[in-house]
Structure formats: structure tokens, C-alpha cells
């Protein structure tokens, strides 16, 4: 048993049929010694008396809020949550496996630049009685500070018959140098509580590996005289790290016909313009990637050819 | 990226082209190591991230873009103790800091070159003959060092008498390649920045 926060405790249980459970000793937070009684939840049924209560926690019915009283007055509460371990593996019932980039990926994180700010998100099919808290640090043995906000519901999607809820959180490394070479990964820890079930999820990464620039901005076409060619120009996204001559991007320019089956023409360039042939009903798209460290490409920025 | 690429003109700055070749070479070598040593802990998640130049050079600090010198988090340890000559310094306007920066890069390359050569000598003794260092990568390191052209004492190649532990050597190779790739990225950024300046 360990304390998650004030008056909230997590009991770690091996979860299998007829498991013996865990013996837990609760202590009433009071200077009083006599006349103390204990109840579970809002029940008036007395479970025991005395400053301490020893209970055998086996299942969810044994979790909940234990209260010690004296003469009708509440002295203190202890909320017990359960953390299930099945076949030696901690349960992951609350969050959905996103399976990208690999199986057992519950948390996904992205950064738009090297400022030390990043966003993580996760999915669940649960919509009520759910709370999350997020902690993060750079490294784990001698952790350096990363500050995370509150997790918020960022999207709802219908997947077949089920609804899926996306939660996200923004974090910022307290003292980040965009040019630094990371040797210790960022650790992100999410505590998830659904009713009386506790689970924790972790992710470890370097900012350089989760970089995904915003799409290029101000995408424009300039037709070239007496030619089917156009000059496509764009700019670095506002959110990208500066100076751009140090944090350089490379770009992919694509000409795509109306039909998905049509052949795509692609050109790669380090410049912020390119000359391409614009076909009727086609569109021109440009995306960006760090020029020197191949993390994710941005989403496409697009303009129609006409 | 095997599709058409509009390549930039190397410009006035002779080291930019070499640094781009260096990054390409080390990235290819790292990819080859990951594939060849698939049953060894060789991915970024599996290895310990060690920097052999730590406390010996300070490339990130010495080569910091002016725009980032206002960021206190970037100014933790600006050790400035490097030699100041070299043929990449094409302009008389080159500042003292730029000289320190390029000198620091040179020292990095020299250290990695020694490590890689020592390691290659061990790998050549491996009866499995599983992996060797790409000669192209070693040549590219050499070319960039020559372009930087700093006068510096030669570091003797480490030789060891004991029988090498090939498993450890291969893991050390992965660690070294990961670290060198990260340093090569920094070098490329620096050269690009200096070229634009």
C-alpha cells in the first residue's frame, strides 16, 4: 500500500480467483485513543473499533472510503483504490492501446519545436468517473523539472458502435535549451483512476524523436509565363524553432490529381519554393520535416491548382 | 529519400558540404548497425546515451547561434579554451567565438575518429565478422577534419592487449554511433547557420 495523495491510498493486488489479497492497517488521524469506530463508504455498519483497523483487501467491495468516527463526529477518511496485477502484469483497462508506433502504446507525445514544450494524448472508451494526473521529468534517477498542466478532454470520436475519448496534456521543460543534445529522456507518468481502480502509464522519449513541425504557412502559387509550370512558395511555420538557418527544415512538394489513383509527383527541397507542373483539378501540397534529424513529417498544407 | 532532390549550392562555406556528407554517412552506418545487430540492444530506447566528448569539448555551447545566447538555459557551461586557426574561416569577419566553435568541432571529430578506429581494429578480430565500420564514414570524418584544418596534437590510437569482448564492443559501437549521429546533427546545424551568416 502506498499514498497517492493525501488520504488516498493504492493497494496493489495480485488478481486471480481466490487470491488471498492484501492485509491493510488503517490508522485514524486523530489524537483521540478511545471510542473510535470505523465504517466503509456511507454505510452505518461498524467494521471495527479502535485507533487502527485491520482489513483484508481482496476485491473492489473492499476498496472505497474508510471513515473513523467518534460520537457521531467524523475524525478522518482513507480512500483505498485498487491496482490490479494479473499474471505479473499491471492492468491496463482504462486506456486504449493506440498500437502506433508499436503495440502497448498508451501515451503518444509530439513537439512542434525544440523549445521543451510538448503535448501528450491518450484514448479511452470511458466517459465518466475518470480522473487523470500527469507528472513529468527529464531523467529518472536525478530528475530535472518538467511542468505539466491538467489533462483535458480534447476530442470525442465515434468508432463503430463505441465512442472514444481523447485526453491531452501540455508540458514544458523548466529550463530547456533548443540547441541542447539530449542524453536523458523525458519521462511522462500518467495516473489514471476510474472509480476505485488505479492504473499508471508511462512514456519515455527524447524531444528530438517526437518532433512534428506544423505545416508550412502562406502556401502560394505563381504561374510562370507561357508555361504549365507554377512556382510554389511557402514559409516556415510560426511555431518552428529559430533561427531557421540553424533549425532548418526540408520540404516535400506533391502534386496530386483529384483521383487518389492518379500518380503523385513529388519533389524534395531545402528551399522555400519549387517549380512544378500544375495539372487541371490537381492540388499542390507541401509538408515539412527537420532537415537533419528525420523525425515526423508535418501534416500537408494544400492549395488547389486552379 | 530516393526521389528528386533540389540540392542547395554549397555556397561560400567549404565545410557545409562535408558536414552534410558526415551526417549522411553516420546515419547510414547507424541504420546498418541496427539491422545487423538486431539481437543486440542497439535502438535509441535500449542504449545508454553516453557522450565521449563530455567535459572535453563544448561544441553546443561554443557554437550556439547568437539568437540563443539570450536563453539562460543554453549558457550553462561555456568553456572557451580552443585553438583559433583553420581554413573554414573564410572571412576576416569571423569572430573569436566562431573560431572556438570550429575548433571544438575539430576536437570532437578527432576523438570520435580515434574511438572508431580502435573499435574497428577490435571488430576485425571478431571470428563472426558480423560488422565493421564503413570506410566511407571514416573517410568523411577525415575530409571534414582536413577542411577544418586545425593544428592539434595527434592522439595515439588506443591499443589493448587483452582479448576483446565482442559483445561489449558491438554495444559500445551502437552507443558511439548514436552519440556521433546526434553530434553530426549539431555540426550540420552549425555549418548551415555559419553558411547563412
Amino acid at each position: 500500500i502506498w499514498e497517492l495523495k493525501k488520504d488516498v491510498y493504492v493497494v496493489e493486488l495480485d488478481w486471480y480467483p481466490d487470491a488471498p489479497g492484501e492485509m491493510v492497517v488503517l490508522t485514524c488521524d486523530t489524537p483521540e485513543e478511545d471510542g473510535i469506530t470505523w465504517t466503509l463508504d456511507q454505510s452505518s455498519e461498524v467494521l471495527g473499533s479502535g485507533k487502527t483497523l485491520t482489513i483484508q483487501v481482496k476485491e473492489f467491495g473492499d476498496a472505497g472510503q474508510y471513515t473513523c468516527h467518534k460520537g457521531g463526529e467524523v475524525l478522518s477518511h482513507s480512500l483505498l483504490l485498487l491496482h490490479k496485477k494479473e499474471d505479473g502484469i499491471w492492468s491496463t483497462d482504462i486506456l486504449k492501446d493506440q498500437k502506433e508506433p508499436k503495440n502497448k502504446t498508451f501515451l503518444r507525445c509530439e513537439a512542434k519545436n525544440y523549445s521543451g514544450r510538448f503535448t501528450c494524448w491518450w484514448l479511452t472508451t470511458i466517459s465518466t468517473d475518470l480522473t487523470f494526473s500527469v507528472k513529468s521529468s527529464r531523467g529518472s534517477s536525478d530528475p530535472q523539472g518538467v511542468t505539466c498542466g491538467a489533462a483535458t478532454l480534447s476530442a470525442e470520436r465515434v468508432r463503430g458502435d463505441n465512442k472514444e475519448y481523447e485526453y491531452s496534456v501540455e508540458c514544458q521543460e523548466d529550463s530547456a535549451c533548443p540547441a541542447a543534445e539530449e542524453s536523458l529522456p523525458i519521462e511522462v507518468m500518467v495516473d489514471a483512476v476510474h472509480k476505485l481502480k488505479y492504473e499508471n502509464y508511462t512514456s519515455s522519449f527524447f524531444i528530438r524523436d517526437i518532433i512534428k513541425p506544423d505545416p508550412p504557412k502562406n502556401l502560394q502559387l505563381k504561374p510562370l509565363k507561357n508555361s504549365r509550370q507554377v512556382e510554389v512558395s511557402w514559409e516556415y511555420p510560426d511555431t518552428w524553432s529559430t533561427p531557421h538557418s540553424y533549425f532548418s527544415l526540408t520540404f516535400c512538394v506533391q502534386v496530386q490529381g483529384k483521383s487518389k489513383r492518379e500518380k503523385k509527383d513529388r519533389v524534395f527541397t531545402d528551399k522555400t519554393s519549387a517549380t512544378v507542373i500544375c495539372r487541371k483539378n490537381a492540388s499542390i501540397s507541401v509538408r515539412a520535416q527537420d532537415r537533419y534529424y528525420s523525425s515526423s513529417w508535418s501534416e500537408w498544407a494544400s492549395v488547389p491548382c486552379s | 529519400r530516393n526521389l528528386p532532390v533540389a540540392t542547395p549550392d554549397p555556397g561560400m562555406f567549404p565545410c557545409l558540404h562535408h558536414s552534410q556528407n558526415l551526417l549522411r554517412a553516420v546515419s547510414n552506418m547507424l541504420q546498418k548497425a541496427r539491422q545487423t545487430l538486431e539481437f543486440y540492444p542497439c535502438t535509441s530506447e535500449e542504449i545508454d546515451h553516453e557522450d565521449i566528448t563530455k567535459d572535453k569539448t563544448s561544441t553546443v555551447e561554443a557554437c550556439l547561434p547568437l539568437e540563443l545566447t539570450k536563453n539562460e538555459s543554453c549558457l550553462n557551461s561555456r568553456e572557451t579554451s580552443f585553438i583559433t586557426n583553420g581554413s573554414c574561416l573564410a572571412s576576416r569577419k569571423t569572430s573569436f567565438m566562431m573560431a572556438l566553435c570550429l575548433s571544438s568541432i575539430y576536437e570532437d571529430l578527432k576523438m570520435y575518429q580515434v574511438e572508431f578506429k580502435t573499435m574497428n581494429a577490435k571488430l576485425l578480430m571478431d571470428p563472426k565478422r558480423q560488422i565493421f565500420l564503413d570506410q566511407n564514414m571514416l573517410a568523411v570524418i577525415d575530409e571534414l577534419m582536413q577542411a577544418l584544418n586545425f593544428n592539434s596534437e595527434t592522439v595515439p590510437q588506443k591499443s589493448s592487449l587483452e582479448e576483446p569482448d565482442f559483445y561489449k564492443t558491438k554495444i559500445k559501437l551502437c552507443i558511439l554511433l548514436h552519440a556521433f549521429r546526434i553530434r553530426a546533427v549539431t555540426i550540420d546545424r552549425v555549418m548551415s547557420y555559419l553558411n547563412a551568416s
Partner: antibody
Framework: EVTLRESGPGLVKPTQTLTLTCTLY??????????VSWIRQPPGKGLEWLAH???????YYNPSLKSQLTISKDTSKNQVVLKLTSVDPVDTATYYC????????????WGQGTLVTVSS | DIQMTQSPSSLSASVGDRVTITCKAS??????VAWFQQKPGKAPKLLIY???NRYTGVPDRFSGSGYGTDFTFTISSLQPEDIATYYC?????????FGGGTKVEIK
């Protein structure tokens, strides 16, 4: 002793707004972890959950009725109020409020219910 | 919405009989299932929560089991006072939904 008591108009005309009040005795909605749900049961039919409010004001609604429902609390009076707008004869039902806490997450105490008839 | 399909819709049994009611969820609801008893003209009463936990003061002849999508409610020895309609309810996900009910009568 924990009890909940619903009160409502008994008869409402179609298109009007139905306002129901649940008064709580023996526990306080200002206590951390306390919550109250509303459930209804048309004559001779099953139960339908409508809305829930927690002590901190956080609430959940049945999506099929969300646009018509508003749940609120008056901590000083220890009351929970449910408003259902644009009522229709199909909203004729016995309306129950029930306590649901963040400790056993079950509707453990129910009011006796109040019958509301929607008719012109 | 998660559908809770309860069966049978009604049953008739003798005093002392073992009575079993099942509830099937249209998707996994973990163990977030409660069972209620409702007597004519009265409000429902909580019997079981978290699928298998008997609420305070509920006689031990009432029990529940199940996890995921399949849940069972059992009265080990039917008593005359058990004549009522029994409902299962999931609160894994909003909207919280009830089964259609099972009316239990004495033969």
C-alpha cells in the same frame, strides 16, 4: 438517516419546462465525493438515467436528452434541481433522484419518486 | 450507448428455489454493474455493486458475478418477500443504462 425527497408539479403541459427538486437529508452535497442522479420510469416500463451532478459541480447528461436537460445544485438548501425543457407526453413518468458517491459508485439511496404527467 | 440485455423478462419459481438472472452488455463494461430490486409502487433498492459486492444489509442469499460483458444475479433460495422486478445497470460509460428488468413471481 439518509433520505432524498423529490418534488415536482404533478401535471405539465406539452412544450413547457418541467422543474424537479430533490431535497437531501442526512448528508450534504458539499461533502467531497457526493453526487446525485436523476432517473425516470414511465408507467409500466423500465428505468432511464437522465443526469448526474457531483459535489464540485461536475456533471454528466444522457446524450439523447442533453439539449433539453439542465442539472444544478443549491448547496445552501442542500437541493438538486433538474429542468427538462419542451416536454412531451412521452416524458410522463415517475422521476427519482438517487445518491451516488465517489466511494462505492452506486446509487445507494433513492427518493420515493414523484409522478409527472405531461398532458394538455 | 451500451445496451444491457436482461433475461428472462419474467420467471416464476417456488419458495426455496435457486433463481438466476443474466445480463449481457453490448460491449465490455469491466465490473461496473449494479443490480437493483424494485417492488410495485416503490423506488429501486441497491443490492449488488461492482458486479459481485453485496450492499450493506442485503441478505447473503443475493449474489452477483461476472466481468466484461456477461453478468449473473442469483437468489440462492427464493423467499416470498423477494417478489419484485430486478434490474441490472452499467455505469462504465455514459449514458448509464439499465436492463429491461426481470419480473420474479412465486409459483
Amino acid at each position: 438517516e439518509v433520505t432524498l425527497r423529490e418534488s415536482g408539479p404533478g401535471l405539465v403541459k406539452p412544450t413547457q419546462t418541467l422543474t424537479l427538486t430533490c431535497t437531501l437529508y442526512g448528508f450534504s452535497l458539499s461533502t467531497s465525493g457526493m453526487g446525485v442522479s436523476w432517473i425516470r420510469q414511465p408507467p409500466g416500463k423500465g428505468l432511464e438515467w437522465l443526469a448526474h451532478i457531483w459535489w464540485d459541480g461536475d456533471n454528466y447528461y444522457n446524450p439523447s436528452l442533453k439539449s433539453q436537460l439542465t442539472i444544478s445544485k443549491d448547496t445552501s438548501k442542500n437541493q438538486v434541481v433538474l429542468k427538462l425543457t419542451s416536454v412531451d407526453p412521452v416524458d410522463t413518468a415517475t422521476y427519482y433522484c438517487a445518491r451516488r458517491t465517489r466511494v462505492n459508485y452506486a446509487m445507494d439511496y433513492w427518493g420515493q419518486g414523484t409522478l409527472v404527467t405531461v398532458s394538455s | 450507448d451500451i445496451q444491457m440485455t436482461q433475461s428472462p423478462s419474467s420467471l416464476s419459481a417456488s419458495v426455496g428455489d435457486r433463481v438466476t438472472i443474466t445480463c449481457k452488455a453490448s460491449q465490455s463494461v469491466s465490473n461496473d454493474v449494479a443490480w437493483f430490486q424494485q417492488k410495485p409502487g416503490k423506488a429501486p433498492k441497491l443490492l449488488i455493486y461492482y458486479a459481485s459486492n453485496r450492499y450493506t444489509g442485503v441478505p447473503d442469499r443475493f449474489s452477483g458475478s461476472g466481468y466484461g460483458t456477461d453478468f449473473t444475479f442469483t437468489i440462492s433460495s427464493l423467499q416470498p418477500e423477494d417478489i419484485a422486478t430486478y434490474y441490472c445497470q452499467q455505469d462504465y460509460n455514459s449514458p448509464w443504462t439499465f436492463g429491461g428488468g426481470t419480473k420474479v413471481e412465486i409459483k
